[in-house]
Protein backbone atom coordinates (compact mmCIF):
# COMPACT_ATOMS: atom_id res chain seq x y z
CA UNK A 1 0.00 0.00 0.00
CA UNK A 2 1.51 3.08 -1.07
CA UNK A 3 0.86 6.25 0.59
CA UNK A 4 -2.12 8.00 -0.51
CA UNK A 5 -1.39 11.27 -2.42
CA UNK A 6 -4.53 13.82 -0.93
CA UNK A 7 -5.53 16.50 -2.85
CA UNK A 8 -6.91 18.37 0.18
CA UNK A 9 -5.62 18.54 3.68
CA UNK A 10 -7.56 15.88 5.69
CA UNK A 11 -8.92 17.14 9.22
CA UNK A 12 -6.30 16.35 11.78
CA UNK A 13 -7.61 14.61 14.45
CA UNK A 14 -5.82 14.53 17.97
CA UNK A 15 -3.75 15.25 20.28
CA UNK A 16 -0.83 18.18 20.28
CA UNK A 17 2.36 18.06 21.87
CA UNK A 18 4.81 14.27 22.36
CA UNK A 19 5.98 11.12 21.57
CA UNK A 20 5.99 8.53 23.95
CA UNK A 21 8.04 6.27 26.58
CA UNK A 22 10.54 4.82 24.38
CA UNK A 23 13.82 5.07 24.93
CA UNK A 24 15.99 5.08 27.98
CA UNK A 25 18.21 2.14 26.85
CA UNK A 26 20.78 3.22 29.78
CA UNK A 27 23.37 0.93 29.91
CA UNK A 28 23.77 -1.20 27.04
CA UNK A 29 25.55 -4.94 28.29
CA UNK A 30 28.50 -4.69 26.10
CA UNK A 31 29.30 -8.01 24.56
CA UNK A 32 32.21 -8.55 27.23
CA UNK A 33 29.86 -8.46 30.08
CA UNK A 34 29.84 -11.90 31.68
CA UNK A 35 26.93 -12.39 33.50
CA UNK A 36 27.39 -14.00 37.14
CA UNK A 37 27.37 -17.67 37.09
CA UNK A 38 25.53 -17.97 40.39
CA UNK A 39 22.37 -16.27 39.31
CA UNK A 40 22.70 -14.67 35.64
CA UNK A 41 19.74 -12.62 34.38
CA UNK A 42 16.55 -14.58 33.96
CA UNK A 43 13.40 -14.46 31.56
CA UNK A 44 11.95 -11.32 32.53
CA UNK A 45 15.72 -9.28 33.44
CA UNK A 46 15.59 -7.56 29.65
CA UNK A 47 18.49 -5.04 29.75
CA UNK A 48 16.48 -1.81 27.80
CA UNK A 49 14.61 0.86 29.07
CA UNK A 50 12.28 1.36 31.67
CA UNK A 51 9.48 3.86 31.33
CA UNK A 52 11.13 6.98 30.19
CA UNK A 53 9.32 9.66 29.28
CA UNK A 54 9.66 10.82 25.93
CA UNK A 55 10.23 8.75 22.70
CA UNK A 56 13.37 10.12 22.27
CA UNK A 57 14.46 11.42 25.81
CA UNK A 58 16.89 10.42 28.36
CA UNK A 59 16.36 9.35 31.43
CA UNK A 60 19.53 9.29 34.01
CA UNK A 61 20.45 5.73 34.43
CA UNK A 62 20.87 3.71 37.35
CA UNK A 63 21.99 -0.54 37.46
CA UNK A 64 19.51 -2.90 38.78
CA UNK A 65 21.81 -4.58 41.53
CA UNK A 66 24.11 -6.66 40.71
CA UNK A 67 22.64 -10.31 41.44
CA UNK A 68 20.30 -9.84 38.58
CA UNK A 69 23.69 -9.48 36.12
CA UNK A 70 21.31 -7.25 33.64
CA UNK A 71 20.92 -3.02 33.61
CA UNK A 72 17.32 -1.50 33.21
CA UNK A 73 16.35 2.19 33.28
CA UNK A 74 14.62 3.58 36.38
CA UNK A 75 11.40 5.36 35.45
CA UNK A 76 12.75 9.11 34.36
CA UNK A 77 11.15 12.25 35.36
CA UNK A 78 8.54 13.13 32.44
CA UNK A 79 7.25 16.59 31.71
CA UNK A 80 4.00 17.94 31.00
CA UNK A 81 3.04 18.63 27.14
CA UNK A 82 1.02 21.73 26.14
CA UNK A 83 -2.18 21.81 24.41
CA UNK A 84 -2.49 22.52 20.77
CA UNK A 85 -4.92 25.52 20.68
CA UNK A 86 -6.37 23.96 17.28
CA UNK A 87 -6.89 20.93 18.34
CA UNK A 88 -9.48 18.95 20.70
CA UNK A 89 -7.30 18.37 24.18
CA UNK A 90 -7.20 14.86 25.10
CA UNK A 91 -7.90 13.87 28.03
CA UNK A 92 -5.47 11.09 29.09
CA UNK A 93 -3.37 13.47 30.72
CA UNK A 94 -1.55 13.13 34.00
CA UNK A 95 -2.25 15.20 37.75
CA UNK A 96 0.28 17.37 39.07
CA UNK A 97 2.07 16.10 41.83
CA UNK A 98 2.56 19.48 43.60
CA UNK A 99 4.97 21.56 42.35
CA UNK A 100 7.00 19.10 40.56
CA UNK A 101 6.44 19.21 36.98
CA UNK A 102 7.90 15.37 36.54
CA UNK A 103 4.93 13.90 34.39
CA UNK A 104 3.90 15.35 31.18
CA UNK A 105 0.65 14.59 29.13
CA UNK A 106 -0.68 15.40 25.40
CA UNK A 107 -2.95 18.63 25.51
CA UNK A 108 -2.03 20.24 28.96
CA UNK A 109 -0.06 22.80 30.82
CA UNK A 110 2.45 23.69 31.64
CA UNK A 111 4.03 24.72 27.69
CA UNK A 112 6.96 22.35 26.71
CA UNK A 113 9.33 24.44 26.02
CA UNK A 114 9.14 25.77 29.91
CA UNK A 115 9.92 22.39 31.33
CA UNK A 116 12.42 21.11 28.34
CA UNK A 117 13.83 23.96 26.54
CA UNK A 118 14.67 21.64 23.51
CA UNK A 119 10.55 21.48 22.64
CA UNK A 120 10.92 24.69 21.42
CA UNK A 121 14.05 23.97 19.18
CA UNK A 122 13.47 24.69 15.41
CA UNK A 123 13.96 21.32 14.01
CA UNK A 124 11.31 19.09 15.66
CA UNK A 125 9.49 16.43 14.97
CA UNK A 126 6.51 15.54 13.71
CA UNK A 127 6.41 17.12 10.55
CA UNK A 128 3.97 16.96 7.38
CA UNK A 129 5.82 15.08 4.49
CA UNK A 130 5.16 16.60 1.01
CA UNK A 131 6.80 13.97 -1.52
CA UNK A 132 6.91 16.87 -4.04
CA UNK A 133 9.25 18.90 -2.54
CA UNK A 134 11.11 15.35 -1.25
CA UNK A 135 14.92 15.81 -2.60
CA UNK A 136 15.08 12.07 -4.04
CA UNK A 137 18.72 10.72 -2.94
CA UNK A 138 19.76 7.41 -4.62
CA UNK A 139 22.53 7.28 -2.14
CA UNK A 140 19.71 6.32 0.11
CA UNK A 141 20.21 2.79 0.03
CA UNK A 142 17.58 -0.09 1.32
CA UNK A 143 17.06 -0.26 4.89
CA UNK A 144 19.11 -3.48 6.48
CA UNK A 145 17.72 -4.96 9.31
CA UNK A 146 19.29 -8.54 10.99
CA UNK A 147 18.35 -9.91 14.11
CA UNK A 148 15.01 -9.31 14.27
CA UNK A 149 12.65 -12.35 13.95
CA UNK A 150 12.98 -13.17 17.81
CA UNK A 151 12.21 -16.41 19.55
CA UNK A 152 9.02 -16.51 21.42
CA UNK A 153 11.43 -17.03 24.30
CA UNK A 154 12.43 -14.51 25.94
CA UNK A 155 9.18 -13.34 26.47
CA UNK A 156 9.21 -9.06 26.41
CA UNK A 157 7.97 -6.30 28.42
CA UNK A 158 4.50 -5.01 26.98
CA UNK A 159 3.61 -2.08 28.57
CA UNK A 160 0.97 0.81 28.57
CA UNK A 161 3.26 3.64 30.31
CA UNK A 162 0.36 5.97 29.93
CA UNK A 163 0.79 7.45 27.00
CA UNK A 164 1.53 4.61 24.75
CA UNK A 165 1.97 0.89 24.56
CA UNK A 166 5.51 -0.27 24.59
CA UNK A 167 7.75 -3.09 23.52
CA UNK A 168 10.68 -3.21 25.34
CA UNK A 169 13.24 -4.87 22.71
CA UNK A 170 16.12 -7.00 23.89
CA UNK A 171 19.62 -6.77 22.52
CA UNK A 172 21.02 -8.08 19.07
CA UNK A 173 18.79 -6.42 17.11
CA UNK A 174 20.81 -4.46 14.25
CA UNK A 175 19.30 -1.91 11.58
CA UNK A 176 21.86 -0.35 9.10
CA UNK A 177 20.55 3.33 7.78
CA UNK A 178 23.64 2.77 5.54
CA UNK A 179 27.54 2.13 5.15
CA UNK A 180 28.81 2.66 8.67
CA UNK A 181 25.23 3.68 9.73
CA UNK A 182 24.56 1.41 12.12
CA UNK A 183 21.60 1.00 15.40
CA UNK A 184 20.53 -1.04 17.91
CA UNK A 185 16.69 -1.85 18.44
CA UNK A 186 15.65 -0.59 21.94
CA UNK A 187 11.75 -0.40 21.91
CA UNK A 188 8.92 0.11 20.00
CA UNK A 189 5.42 1.73 21.00
CA UNK A 190 2.42 2.85 18.75
CA UNK A 191 0.65 6.04 18.10
CA UNK A 192 -3.06 6.45 17.69
CA UNK A 193 -6.06 8.50 17.28
CA UNK A 194 -9.72 7.34 18.51
CA UNK A 195 -13.12 6.33 17.31
CA UNK A 196 -13.22 7.86 13.94
CA UNK A 197 -10.03 9.91 14.27
CA UNK A 198 -6.95 9.51 12.68
CA UNK A 199 -4.29 9.46 15.08
CA UNK A 200 -0.79 9.08 13.00
CA UNK A 201 2.08 11.67 14.17
CA UNK A 202 3.93 12.20 11.06
CA UNK A 203 0.92 13.15 8.13
CA UNK A 204 1.51 13.29 4.70
CA UNK A 205 0.38 16.48 2.67
CA UNK A 206 -1.74 17.17 5.51
CA UNK A 207 -3.11 13.78 5.54
CA UNK A 208 -3.52 12.03 9.04
CA UNK A 209 -3.61 8.19 9.57
CA UNK A 210 -4.97 6.06 11.49
CA UNK A 211 -1.94 5.36 13.35
CA UNK A 212 1.58 5.11 13.42
CA UNK A 213 4.12 2.85 14.60
CA UNK A 214 7.86 3.49 16.22
CA UNK A 215 10.77 1.50 16.45
CA UNK A 216 13.97 3.48 18.25
CA UNK A 217 17.05 2.87 17.40
CA UNK A 218 20.55 3.99 19.66
CA UNK A 219 23.60 4.43 17.38
CA UNK A 220 26.21 1.76 18.13
CA UNK A 221 28.77 4.71 18.45
CA UNK A 222 26.95 5.15 21.71
CA UNK A 223 26.81 3.08 24.67
CA UNK A 224 23.91 5.03 26.34
CA UNK A 225 20.96 7.14 25.22
CA UNK A 226 21.84 9.92 27.12
CA UNK A 227 25.04 10.10 25.54
CA UNK A 228 23.27 10.14 22.43
CA UNK A 229 20.60 12.42 22.91
CA UNK A 230 20.75 15.52 20.98
CA UNK A 231 23.82 14.45 18.97
CA UNK A 232 22.86 14.18 15.28
CA UNK A 233 22.50 10.43 14.06
CA UNK A 234 22.46 9.18 17.99
CA UNK A 235 18.95 8.08 17.71
CA UNK A 236 17.29 6.66 14.91
CA UNK A 237 13.38 5.88 14.71
CA UNK A 238 11.80 3.72 11.99
CA UNK A 239 8.27 5.27 11.60
CA UNK A 240 5.03 3.53 9.71
CA UNK A 241 2.06 4.64 9.20
CA UNK A 242 -1.21 2.21 10.19
CA UNK A 243 -4.11 2.04 7.82
CA UNK A 244 -7.18 -0.08 7.69
CA UNK A 245 -7.32 -2.87 5.15
CA UNK A 246 -9.98 -5.90 4.71
CA UNK A 247 -7.83 -8.72 6.94
CA UNK A 248 -6.48 -8.97 10.07
CA UNK A 249 -3.19 -8.70 10.58
CA UNK A 250 -0.80 -11.61 12.55
CA UNK A 251 1.49 -9.97 13.46
CA UNK A 252 0.14 -6.84 15.17
CA UNK A 253 -2.44 -9.32 16.63
CA UNK A 254 0.21 -10.81 18.92
CA UNK A 255 0.39 -7.24 20.62
CA UNK A 256 -3.49 -6.00 20.27
CA UNK A 257 -4.53 -9.63 22.06
CA UNK A 258 -2.57 -8.74 25.07
CA UNK A 259 -4.27 -5.00 25.60
CA UNK A 260 -6.65 -6.07 27.67
CA UNK A 261 -4.38 -7.34 30.37
CA UNK A 262 -2.60 -3.71 30.56
CA UNK A 263 -5.33 -1.84 30.10
CA UNK A 264 -4.84 0.60 33.51
CA UNK A 265 -2.04 2.91 33.12
CA UNK A 266 1.14 1.73 34.19
CA UNK A 267 0.68 -1.70 34.07
CA UNK A 268 2.55 -4.84 31.66
CA UNK A 269 2.79 -7.89 30.56
CA UNK A 270 4.99 -10.30 29.30
CA UNK A 271 4.35 -11.62 25.39
CA UNK A 272 6.33 -13.99 23.37
CA UNK A 273 8.96 -12.90 21.08
CA UNK A 274 7.88 -12.33 17.41
CA UNK A 275 8.92 -10.91 14.21
CA UNK A 276 9.52 -7.64 15.03
CA UNK A 277 10.50 -7.12 11.26
CA UNK A 278 6.91 -8.26 10.23
CA UNK A 279 5.30 -4.87 12.21
CA UNK A 280 6.56 -3.19 9.67
CA UNK A 281 6.01 -2.43 6.06
CA UNK A 282 8.06 -4.94 3.30
CA UNK A 283 9.42 -2.67 1.19
CA UNK A 284 12.86 -1.39 3.05
CA UNK A 285 13.48 0.22 0.04
CA UNK A 286 11.30 3.58 -0.19
CA UNK A 287 11.54 5.48 2.39
CA UNK A 288 11.61 9.53 3.07
CA UNK A 289 14.12 10.50 5.95
CA UNK A 290 14.90 14.04 7.41
CA UNK A 291 16.76 14.87 10.87
CA UNK A 292 14.44 16.25 13.56
CA UNK A 293 13.56 14.85 17.17
CA UNK A 294 12.34 12.93 19.91
CA UNK A 295 8.11 13.79 19.87
CA UNK A 296 7.81 13.88 23.41
CA UNK A 297 10.11 16.24 26.22
CA UNK A 298 13.21 16.54 26.81
CA UNK A 299 11.92 16.88 22.60
CA UNK A 300 16.36 16.23 21.80
CA UNK A 301 17.23 17.00 18.49
CA UNK A 302 18.99 15.05 16.09
CA UNK A 303 16.93 12.21 15.67
CA UNK A 304 17.33 10.39 12.42
CA UNK A 305 13.52 9.70 11.19
CA UNK A 306 13.28 7.16 8.56
CA UNK A 307 9.41 6.79 6.81
CA UNK A 308 8.43 4.23 5.47
CA UNK A 309 6.12 5.08 1.89
CA UNK A 310 4.53 1.38 2.41
CA UNK A 311 2.01 1.70 4.92
CA UNK A 312 0.72 -1.67 6.66
CA UNK A 313 -2.62 -3.01 6.85
CA UNK A 314 -4.71 -3.70 10.21
CA UNK A 315 -8.34 -4.81 10.53
CA UNK A 316 -10.84 -2.06 11.39
CA UNK A 317 -11.51 -4.30 14.71
CA UNK A 318 -7.71 -3.85 14.76
CA UNK A 319 -7.58 -0.81 14.62
CA UNK A 320 -10.75 -0.10 17.29
CA UNK A 321 -8.89 -2.50 19.97
CA UNK A 322 -5.45 -0.45 19.77
CA UNK A 323 -7.74 3.09 20.35
CA UNK A 324 -9.99 1.83 22.54
CA UNK A 325 -8.43 -0.72 24.96
CA UNK A 326 -6.27 1.38 26.96
CA UNK A 327 -6.35 3.65 29.62
CA UNK A 328 -4.53 6.67 30.87
CA UNK A 329 -4.37 7.92 34.26
CA UNK A 330 -7.40 8.97 36.17
CA UNK A 331 -10.17 7.54 34.55
CA UNK A 332 -9.14 8.73 30.81
CA UNK A 333 -8.67 6.54 27.52
CA UNK A 334 -5.66 6.55 26.26
CA UNK A 335 -6.77 8.26 22.84
CA UNK A 336 -5.06 11.08 20.74
CA UNK A 337 -1.27 9.99 21.66
CA UNK A 338 0.28 12.22 18.60
CA UNK A 339 1.99 15.50 18.87
CA UNK A 340 1.33 18.27 16.22
CA UNK A 341 3.27 18.75 13.29
CA UNK A 342 5.92 21.10 13.65
CA UNK A 343 7.72 23.49 10.88
CA UNK A 344 10.22 22.32 9.04
CA UNK A 345 12.57 25.69 9.53
CA UNK A 346 14.20 25.41 5.88
CA UNK A 347 14.88 21.46 6.78
CA UNK A 348 14.47 18.94 3.70
CA UNK A 349 13.28 15.98 3.87
CA UNK A 350 14.96 13.09 1.62
CA UNK A 351 13.30 10.29 -0.31
CA UNK A 352 15.34 7.30 -1.27
CA UNK A 353 12.91 7.04 -4.42
CA UNK A 354 11.10 9.68 -7.04
CA UNK A 355 8.75 10.28 -4.59
CA UNK A 356 7.99 13.83 -6.93
CA UNK A 357 6.89 11.45 -9.76
CA UNK A 358 3.08 10.94 -9.78
CA UNK A 359 3.09 11.89 -6.12
CA UNK A 360 0.08 14.09 -7.02
CA UNK A 361 -2.75 15.24 -9.20
CA UNK A 362 -2.05 17.96 -8.60
CA UNK A 363 1.09 18.23 -9.94
CA UNK A 364 0.92 17.64 -14.36
CA UNK A 365 4.91 17.47 -14.20
CA UNK A 366 7.12 15.97 -11.77
CA UNK A 367 8.97 18.96 -10.14
CA UNK A 368 11.75 17.89 -8.10
CA UNK A 369 12.47 21.35 -6.22
CA UNK A 370 15.16 20.41 -3.65
CA UNK A 371 18.50 19.00 -4.71
CA UNK A 372 20.03 15.77 -2.17
CA UNK A 373 21.96 16.52 0.09
CA UNK A 374 23.87 13.46 0.22
CA UNK A 375 24.64 13.14 -3.41
CA UNK A 376 28.11 13.06 -2.87
CA UNK A 377 27.43 9.73 -0.61
CA UNK B 1 24.25 -23.45 45.44
CA UNK B 2 22.79 -23.16 42.18
CA UNK B 3 21.40 -26.39 41.24
CA UNK B 4 18.93 -28.61 39.18
CA UNK B 5 18.35 -32.04 40.96
CA UNK B 6 15.90 -34.56 38.52
CA UNK B 7 13.78 -37.33 39.15
CA UNK B 8 10.92 -39.83 37.18
CA UNK B 9 12.76 -41.61 34.49
CA UNK B 10 13.01 -45.40 34.13
CA UNK B 11 11.73 -48.27 31.87
CA UNK B 12 8.44 -47.93 30.02
CA UNK B 13 6.78 -50.08 27.79
CA UNK B 14 5.80 -47.98 24.34
CA UNK B 15 2.49 -46.43 24.71
CA UNK B 16 3.12 -45.90 28.13
CA UNK B 17 3.51 -42.73 30.38
CA UNK B 18 6.43 -40.77 32.45
CA UNK B 19 6.39 -38.13 34.54
CA UNK B 20 9.68 -35.94 34.92
CA UNK B 21 10.31 -33.54 37.89
CA UNK B 22 13.36 -31.04 38.18
CA UNK B 23 13.85 -29.38 41.60
CA UNK B 24 15.14 -25.82 40.92
CA UNK B 25 17.26 -24.55 44.43
CA UNK B 26 19.41 -21.51 44.59
CA UNK B 27 17.78 -18.81 42.37
CA UNK B 28 14.71 -17.37 41.82
CA UNK B 29 12.69 -20.01 40.01
CA UNK B 30 10.07 -18.58 38.92
CA UNK B 31 11.86 -15.22 36.91
CA UNK B 32 13.23 -18.54 34.44
CA UNK B 33 12.60 -19.54 31.24
CA UNK B 34 12.87 -23.45 31.76
CA UNK B 35 13.52 -26.01 29.07
CA UNK B 36 13.86 -29.55 28.80
CA UNK B 37 16.69 -31.18 26.33
CA UNK B 38 17.05 -34.70 25.06
CA UNK B 39 20.18 -37.11 24.36
CA UNK B 40 19.46 -40.16 22.63
CA UNK B 41 22.17 -42.96 23.43
CA UNK B 42 25.77 -42.20 21.25
CA UNK B 43 23.24 -39.35 19.83
CA UNK B 44 23.53 -35.28 20.08
CA UNK B 45 21.26 -32.79 22.09
CA UNK B 46 17.84 -32.05 21.10
CA UNK B 47 15.90 -29.07 22.54
CA UNK B 48 11.97 -31.07 23.44
CA UNK B 49 10.25 -28.41 25.34
CA UNK B 50 10.54 -24.89 26.97
CA UNK B 51 8.09 -23.01 29.38
CA UNK B 52 8.40 -19.08 30.09
CA UNK B 53 8.78 -18.17 33.99
CA UNK B 54 5.47 -18.09 34.74
CA UNK B 55 4.35 -21.01 32.95
CA UNK B 56 1.98 -18.50 31.07
CA UNK B 57 3.95 -20.05 26.93
CA UNK B 58 4.61 -23.31 26.52
CA UNK B 59 6.69 -24.58 23.66
CA UNK B 60 7.11 -28.16 22.02
CA UNK B 61 9.27 -29.50 19.12
CA UNK B 62 7.42 -31.05 17.06
CA UNK B 63 8.28 -34.63 17.64
CA UNK B 64 7.23 -34.45 20.94
CA UNK B 65 4.13 -32.16 20.32
CA UNK B 66 0.37 -33.07 21.47
CA UNK B 67 2.39 -36.17 23.43
CA UNK B 68 4.36 -34.21 26.22
CA UNK B 69 3.13 -31.62 28.26
CA UNK B 70 5.60 -29.54 29.82
CA UNK B 71 4.41 -27.47 33.20
CA UNK B 72 5.78 -25.75 36.59
CA UNK B 73 4.87 -25.05 40.06
CA UNK B 74 6.79 -21.94 41.07
CA UNK B 75 5.32 -22.90 44.21
CA UNK B 76 7.69 -25.53 44.79
CA UNK B 77 10.42 -24.09 42.74
CA UNK B 78 9.74 -27.42 40.34
CA UNK B 79 9.36 -27.99 36.62
CA UNK B 80 7.55 -31.11 34.93
CA UNK B 81 7.80 -33.10 31.96
CA UNK B 82 4.55 -35.14 31.15
CA UNK B 83 5.62 -37.99 29.16
CA UNK B 84 2.31 -39.98 26.67
CA UNK B 85 1.80 -42.10 24.32
CA UNK B 86 5.77 -42.95 24.34
CA UNK B 87 8.31 -44.56 21.70
CA UNK B 88 10.78 -46.42 21.16
CA UNK B 89 12.42 -42.99 19.72
CA UNK B 90 11.62 -41.50 23.14
CA UNK B 91 14.49 -43.24 24.54
CA UNK B 92 16.70 -40.88 25.83
CA UNK B 93 18.82 -39.21 28.74
CA UNK B 94 16.36 -36.65 29.19
CA UNK B 95 17.41 -32.77 31.10
CA UNK B 96 15.81 -30.24 32.50
CA UNK B 97 17.98 -26.68 31.97
CA UNK B 98 17.89 -23.57 33.35
CA UNK B 99 17.54 -20.26 30.57
CA UNK B 100 19.63 -17.65 31.33
CA UNK B 101 18.61 -14.44 29.52
CA UNK B 102 22.07 -13.72 28.27
CA UNK B 103 21.81 -10.07 26.30
CA UNK B 104 17.80 -10.98 25.02
CA UNK B 105 19.33 -14.71 24.04
CA UNK B 106 18.61 -17.73 26.22
CA UNK B 107 21.41 -20.37 26.80
CA UNK B 108 21.25 -22.62 28.85
CA UNK B 109 23.36 -22.10 31.19
CA UNK B 110 22.37 -24.45 34.30
CA UNK B 111 21.96 -28.30 33.73
CA UNK B 112 20.53 -31.21 35.58
CA UNK B 113 22.14 -34.64 36.24
CA UNK B 114 19.78 -35.84 33.41
CA UNK B 115 17.38 -39.02 33.95
CA UNK B 116 17.60 -42.23 31.61
CA UNK B 117 13.76 -42.99 30.22
CA UNK B 118 13.98 -46.51 28.16
CA UNK B 119 10.66 -46.90 26.05
CA UNK B 120 11.10 -50.60 24.92
CA UNK B 121 8.78 -53.77 25.17
CA UNK C 1 20.85 -34.27 9.85
CA UNK C 2 21.24 -31.54 12.20
CA UNK C 3 20.40 -27.74 11.06
CA UNK C 4 23.85 -26.72 12.45
CA UNK C 5 26.48 -28.55 10.93
CA UNK C 6 29.70 -29.07 13.35
CA UNK C 7 32.59 -31.89 12.13
CA UNK C 8 32.04 -34.98 14.00
CA UNK C 9 35.44 -35.23 15.27
CA UNK C 10 38.72 -32.66 15.64
CA UNK C 11 42.12 -33.66 17.13
CA UNK C 12 44.90 -32.17 18.51
CA UNK C 13 48.16 -32.46 20.99
CA UNK C 14 48.33 -30.87 23.97
CA UNK C 15 48.94 -27.03 23.92
CA UNK C 16 48.14 -27.09 20.47
CA UNK C 17 45.09 -25.00 18.81
CA UNK C 18 41.87 -26.01 17.78
CA UNK C 19 38.83 -24.72 16.16
CA UNK C 20 35.22 -26.33 15.82
CA UNK C 21 32.85 -24.91 13.27
CA UNK C 22 29.84 -24.43 13.42
CA UNK C 23 27.83 -24.07 10.49
CA UNK C 24 24.09 -22.68 9.56
CA UNK C 25 21.75 -20.67 7.19
CA UNK C 26 19.95 -17.27 6.80
CA UNK C 27 17.39 -18.83 9.06
CA UNK C 28 19.66 -19.18 12.17
CA UNK C 29 22.76 -17.74 12.52
CA UNK C 30 22.61 -15.45 9.75
CA UNK C 31 19.52 -14.15 10.60
CA UNK C 32 21.01 -12.45 13.60
CA UNK C 33 20.92 -15.40 16.24
CA UNK C 34 23.37 -15.64 19.38
CA UNK C 35 25.27 -18.76 18.86
CA UNK C 36 25.56 -20.51 21.86
CA UNK C 37 28.31 -23.57 22.77
CA UNK C 38 28.17 -26.17 25.80
CA UNK C 39 30.98 -28.85 26.87
CA UNK C 40 29.95 -32.55 27.46
CA UNK C 41 32.70 -34.30 29.70
CA UNK C 42 31.53 -38.38 29.14
CA UNK C 43 29.14 -39.27 31.37
CA UNK C 44 28.47 -36.04 32.81
CA UNK C 45 25.63 -32.77 31.92
CA UNK C 46 26.41 -30.31 29.03
CA UNK C 47 27.90 -27.19 30.63
CA UNK C 48 27.40 -23.74 29.17
CA UNK C 49 31.02 -22.93 27.80
CA UNK C 50 29.93 -19.76 25.86
CA UNK C 51 26.99 -17.88 25.38
CA UNK C 52 26.06 -14.64 22.88
CA UNK C 53 28.41 -15.85 20.38
CA UNK C 54 31.84 -14.71 22.24
CA UNK C 55 31.18 -14.73 26.35
CA UNK C 56 32.32 -16.74 29.01
CA UNK C 57 30.64 -17.27 31.65
CA UNK C 58 32.48 -17.06 35.47
CA UNK C 59 34.66 -19.86 35.79
CA UNK C 60 35.60 -20.85 31.74
CA UNK C 61 39.24 -20.75 30.86
CA UNK C 62 40.17 -17.92 28.56
CA UNK C 63 41.69 -20.56 26.69
CA UNK C 64 37.94 -20.85 25.09
CA UNK C 65 37.20 -18.04 22.65
CA UNK C 66 33.90 -18.07 20.41
CA UNK C 67 33.42 -15.87 17.25
CA UNK C 68 30.23 -15.52 14.51
CA UNK C 69 30.78 -14.62 11.14
CA UNK C 70 28.04 -14.46 8.46
CA UNK C 71 26.19 -17.65 8.60
CA UNK C 72 29.14 -19.62 10.99
CA UNK C 73 30.35 -19.76 13.71
CA UNK C 74 33.69 -21.55 15.83
CA UNK C 75 34.94 -22.34 18.82
CA UNK C 76 38.52 -22.24 19.76
CA UNK C 77 40.30 -23.61 22.26
CA UNK C 78 44.26 -22.88 22.80
CA UNK C 79 46.72 -24.39 24.85
CA UNK C 80 44.97 -27.95 24.15
CA UNK C 81 44.50 -29.93 27.89
CA UNK C 82 43.65 -33.78 27.90
CA UNK C 83 40.66 -32.45 30.42
CA UNK C 84 39.55 -30.70 27.36
CA UNK C 85 38.29 -33.89 25.65
CA UNK C 86 34.73 -33.83 25.50
CA UNK C 87 31.75 -33.34 22.87
CA UNK C 88 31.14 -29.84 21.96
CA UNK C 89 27.96 -28.84 20.95
CA UNK C 90 26.64 -25.44 19.52
CA UNK C 91 23.50 -24.11 19.42
CA UNK C 92 21.68 -21.34 17.95
CA UNK C 93 17.37 -20.69 16.99
CA UNK C 94 15.57 -21.09 13.71
CA UNK C 95 13.32 -18.76 12.69
CA UNK C 96 11.71 -21.25 9.96
CA UNK C 97 11.42 -24.31 12.27
CA UNK C 98 8.72 -24.41 14.91
CA UNK C 99 11.30 -26.28 17.17
CA UNK C 100 13.54 -23.15 17.57
CA UNK C 101 16.08 -24.40 19.16
CA UNK C 102 18.59 -25.75 17.78
CA UNK C 103 21.69 -27.80 18.35
CA UNK C 104 24.42 -28.69 15.95
CA UNK C 105 25.27 -32.26 15.85
CA UNK C 106 28.36 -32.07 18.28
CA UNK C 107 32.00 -32.57 17.98
CA UNK C 108 33.91 -35.18 19.77
CA UNK C 109 37.53 -33.28 20.57
CA UNK C 110 40.11 -35.93 20.97
CA UNK C 111 43.58 -34.75 22.56
CA UNK C 112 46.39 -36.79 21.52
Known amino acids: QRLPRMQEDSPLGGGSSGEDDPLGEEDLPSEEDSPREEDPPGEEDLPGEEDLPGEEDLPEVKPKSEEEGSLKLEDLPTVEAPGDPQEPQNNAHRDKEGDDQSHWRYGGDPPWPRVSPACAGRFQSPVDIRPQLAAFCPALRPLELLGFQLPPLPELRLRNNGHSVQLTLPPGLEMALGPGREYRALQLHLHWGAAGRPGSEHTVEGHRFPAEIHVVHLSTAFARVDEALGRPGGLAVLAAFLEEGPEENSAYEQLLSRLEEIAEEGSETQVPGLDISALLPSDFSRYFQYEGSLTTPPCAQGVIWTVFNQTVMLSAKQLHTLSDTLWGPGDSRLQLNFRATQPLNGRVIEASFPAGVDSSPRAAEPVQLNSCLAAGD | QVQLVQSGGGLVQPGGSLRLSCAAS????????MSWVRQAPGKGLEWVSA????????YYADSVKGRFTISRDNSKNTLYLQMNSLRAEDTAVYYC??????????????WGQGTLVTVSS | QSVLTQPPSVSGAPGQRVTISCTGS?????????VHWYQQLPGTAPKLLIY???NRPSGVPDRFSGSKSGTSASLAITGLQAEDEADYYC????????????FGGGTKLTVL
Open chain 2, 97 to 110: ARNGNYRGSLAFDI
Open chain 2, 26 to 33: GFTFSSYA
Open chain 2, 51 to 58: ISGSGGST
Open chain 3, 26 to 34: SSNIGAGYD
Open chain 3, 52 to 54: GNN
Open chain 3, 91 to 102: QSYDSSLSAWVV
